[in-house]
């Protein structure tokens, strides 16, 4: 079945971050082209990348419309012409990706320090609130719009004179930590969503130590 | 000879649905992706909706997804465009055209069918 | 999308002289593992609907006079009539077939001076 001299696509794989997707999938195409579909369980299927001749389509815009339902993508192969000079042997090969559940699933971008600012004893250091392609009302959502109270942030953090690290938990985007007056701290930012079985946590943000630029730490 | 023959065009109020066909002969229609492209009065080309020879793949323009259905019914030789929601900038002469040598590169048009959306 | 820009938009050239039309794409309707230019040109008559001149940039559709030729390349393309005649007198458009949703150039009117 299929038609001839096309192959069909395989190793289908969503890449996905902070709800950007791109479904991913071999093999370049050698006289043929592409189309990618996506459905949720339910609905009707939706055709993406029309005949192309990329190996990734974004499916962002079908997945952010509620990243909570569990899709389903497949790639169609059709022949690098009309079927009439090319052949057919009936309906176009196709290969059906995994189901993926953005909500459960998307992995969670590096995080990035906002900010820290020392008050005597305290050093209140702030997460950025990263924005995603999520929208309610015509606005884009951040992380913490989409995530509410599943999504907490881990610190760790340590003198710069020694390795030994300690750590903080946040269910907001802000920690409060006790430091030693005169003293030099640095620390990383880890997103974490406990109630996951996969991708439950994000990269380590890059590390901040106190009295210098940010970013210029070197270890 | 390869021939396309648009109908269905008409005057339609703002909101109302119309539904074109495209009876094409001539040539093996279910080997062939077939597309809408219209052609507002004194305007440029616009290209609307395509269809893949197999009926399972459609895609649309911006302006009319959502709004237009394009369907085909490959034992009937017929090519369809279900047009919702009419608005006046809707108005235009409707082509329906074969793929030629390659996706997107029309070797054959039809003569077309106008649709005027006015109240 | 890929916008296609036509210039100029009406040419008027006395009968057997050189007709240029340029088209230029907002990115790039090369595929570099065949190395081909999705873009096609077509002429439209008062009244009727578009014929194919062109397609791949360069390959004239068969029976289409020698007197048409496509060049160019990446993102800037010219269609040349080479010796003007009389049933020459249309609009010309271009597009690109690299990518959905396909978009054809405004159109170029020739007429003769």
């Known amino acids: 079945s299929g038609t001839t001299n096309t192959v069909a696509a395989y190793n289908l794989t969503w890449k996905s971050t902070n709800f950007k997707t791109i479904l991913e999938w071999e093999p370049k195409p050698v006289n043929q082209v592409y189309t990618v579909q996506i459905s949720t369980k339910s609905g009707d299927w939706k055709s993406k990348c029309f005949y192309t001749t990329d190996t990734e389509c974004d499916l962002t815009d079908e997945i952010v419309k509620d990243v909570k339902q569990t899709y389903l993508a497949r790639v169609f192969s059709y022949p690098a012409g009309n079927v009439e000079s090319t052949g057919s042997a009936g309906e176009p090969l196709y290969e059906n990706s995994p189901e993926f559940t953005p909500y459960l699933e998307t992995n969670l971008g590096q995080p990035t320090i906002q900010s820290f600012e020392q008050v005597g004893t305290k050093v209140n250091v702030t997460v950025e609130d990263e924005r995603t392609l999520v929208r309610r009302n015509n606005t884009f959502l951040s992380l913490r719009d989409v995530f509410g109270k599943d999504l907490i942030y881990t610190l760790y953090y340590w003198k710069s004179s020694s390795s030994g690290k300690k750590t903080a938990k946040t269910n907001t985007n802000e920690f409060l930590i006790d430091v030693e007056k005169g003293v030099s701290y640095c620390f990383f930012a880890q997103a974490v969503i406990p109630s996951r079985t996969v991708n439950r946590k994000s990269t380590d943000s890059p590390v901040e130590c106190m009295g210098q630029e940010k970013g210029e730490f070197r270890e | 000879q390869v021939q396309l023959v648009e109908s269905g065009g008409g005057v339609v109020q703002p909101g109302r649905s119309l539904r074109l066909s495209c009876a094409a002969s001539?040539?093996?229609?279910?080997?062939?992706?077939m597309h809408w492209v219209r052609q507002a009065p004194g305007k440029g080309l616009e290209w609307v909706a395509v269809?893949?020879?197999?009926?399972?793949?459609?895609y649309y323009a911006d302006s009319v997804e959502g709004r237009f259905t394009i369907s085909r019914d490959n034992s009937k030789n017929t090519l369809y465009l279900q047009m919702n929601s009419l608005r006046a900038e809707d108005t235009a002469v409707y082509y329906c055209?074969?793929?030629?040598?390659?996706?997107?590169?029309?070797?054959?048009w039809g003569q077309g069918t106008l649709v005027t959306v006015s109240s | 999308d890929i916008v296609m820009t036509q210039s100029p938009d009406s040419l008027a050239v006395s009968l057997g002289e050189r007709a240029t039309i340029n088209c230029k794409s907002s990115?790039?309707?090369?595929?570099?593992?065949?190395?081909?230019?999705?873009l096609a040109w077509y002429q439209q008559k008062p009244g009727q609907p578009p014929k194919l001149l062109i397609y791949w940039a360069s390959t004239r559709e068969s029976g289409v006079p020698d007197r048409f030729s496509g060049s160019g390349s990446g993102t800037d393309f010219t269609l040349t009539i080479s010796s003007l005649q009389a049933e020459d007198v249309a609009v010309y458009y271009c597009q690109q077939f690299h990518s959905y949703p396909l978009t054809f150039g405004g159109g170029t009117k020739v007429e003769i001076k």
């Open positions: 055209a074969r793929d030629g040598v390659y996706y997107g590169v029309y070797d054959y």
């Open positions: 269809i893949t020879y197999d009926g399972i793949n459609k």
């Open positions: 990115q790039s309707v090369l595929f570099s593992s065949n190395n081909k230019n999705y």
């Open positions: 001539g040539f093996t229609f279910r080997s062939y992706g």
